[in-house]
């Protein structure tokens, strides 16, 4: 379910110098990029998949979960170089012999087309154009995601216009 965005209106007769509490506002933290209902953070450093997973956790976020092809395309559009790759929150579960998202769900066959081996110690990364599997020990960049959070900002009504 998509979070609702509170509407705001301004009473023109209201004293404009008065500081008012603005209704619910969807905000991404500084340095994070908003992509629809998510905030994404593209790392600058490189790490194995497990370390990338841990880094996202320390930021109160998770490795990127991709719901469908549209979301994949939107994310890939933010990758500005063909030569850069980013870990996402998908790896191969040997016990279940299937690709598994870090939230516990399994990859649907029509969600993403993964190029590469589906085997033990395989994790998934995305590039500007494709989705690949690679040894999880490989050190590369990664993408963390947060759901957009509701924040109450105290603002002057002037800044609403």
């Amino acid at each position: 379910q998509k979070p609702s965005i509170g509407k705001c209106s301004v009473d023109i007769q209201q004293n404009r110098t008065k500081t008012t509490e603005r209704p619910d506002l969807l905000n991404c933290p500084i340095y994070w990029q908003q992509v629809q209902e998510k905030c994404l953070l593209f790392s600058h450093t490189v790490n194995p998949w497990n370390n990338s997973l841990a880094d996202c956790s320390t930021k109160e976020s998770s490795l990127l979960l991709i719901q469908d092809k549209d979301e994949l395309t939107r994310t890939q559009n933010l990758i500005h170089d063909k030569a850069i790759s980013f870990w996402i929150g998908l790896n191969f579960s040997l016990s279940e012999k299937n690709w598994k998202w870090i939230n516990g769900s399994f990859l649907s066959s029509n969600d993403l087309k993964i190029t590469g081996d589906a085997k033990e110690n395989s994790c998934v990364y995305i590039s500007q154009t494709s989705v690949y599997s690679e040894y999880c020990s490989t050190e590369m960049k990664w993408i963390c995601q947060k759901e957009l959070t509701l924040v109450r900002n105290k603002v002057s009504p002037d800044s609403w216009l």
Epitope: H44, T45, V46, P48, D81, K82, A83, I84, S85, T115, G116, Y125, T129, S130, Y132, E134, Y135, S137, T138, E139, M140, K141
Partner: antibody
């Protein structure tokens, strides 16, 4: 200035050893996969070895496996190649190279040193 | 190991000519291919990566194309500084990262 400078080449007898060094400057060395690539006189390019940014992952070409050891010191911004049991066919210019934008194991080499010549001869 | 075969091994051309060099992989490598230029006594220089992406600072007369097993480097209008040897390189995730045998572009 972004650059790589190799050193340590020279003349060595078959069976001997050499240690090559590569000093990096002008970029965040600790974030990049680094490789050694060699070129025998008048011949083509041959990838020798790579090391991941942390040093945890290392690969070698079959032709040098068991004889060469790649290592790095991120605190010193330096890459090394320890070459043992050298053979005449190891004679080449050895280049230190950086991978393009830390792309995982797809290593496009966007920055190269000028190379250092290793000659193995009796 | 994946083998790369470049053709021709040498080509004679004049300034202003269009030059095409091909590289064939022994098995499919998607778009994981690079092209380098090397001049005598110098280190190689990256021209093209990911089969078709132009490396920063490289003139637009250089272009790359192809996917799978067949790749092409094209110099649309040869300049005096382009006379050199050109190498392709495959960069699939499993080493070794092999290079083609090289193509020497000479002055006609």
């Amino acid at each position: 200035q972004v650059q790589l400078v190799e050193s340590g080449g020279g003349l060595v007898k078959p069976g001997g050893s050499l240690r090559l060094s590569c000093a990096a400057s002008g970029f965040t060395f600790s974030q990049y996969y680094m490789s050694w690539i060699r070129q025998a006189p008048g011949k083509g390019l041959e990838w020798v070895s790579y090391i991941s940014p942390s040093g945890a992952t290392i690969y070698y070409a079959d032709s040098v496996k068991g004889r060469f050891t790649i290592s790095r010191d991120n605190a010193k911004n330096s890459l090394y190649l320890q070459m043992n049991s050298l053979r005449a066919e190891d004679t080449a210019v050895y280049y230190c190279a950086r991978s393009l934008m830390a792309t995982g194991t797809h290593l496009y080499f966007d920055l190269w040193g000028r190379g250092t010549l290793v000659t193995v001869s009796s | 190991d994946i083998q790369l075969t470049q053709s021709p091994s040498s080509v004679s051309a004049s300034v202003g000519d269009r030059v095409t060099i091909t590289c064939r992989a022994s098995q499919g490598i998607s778009s994981w291919l690079a092209w380098y230029q090397q001049k005598p006594g110098k280190a190689p220089k990256l021209l093209i990566y990911a089969a078709s992406a132009l490396q920063s600072g490289v003139p637009s007369r250089f272009s790359g194309s192809g996917s799978g097993t067949d790749f092409t480097l094209t110099i649309s209008s040869l300049q005096p500084e382009d006379f050199a040897t050109y190498y392709c390189q495959q960069v699939t995730s499993a080493p070794p990262y092999t290079f083609g045998g090289g193509t020497k572009v000479e002055i006609k």
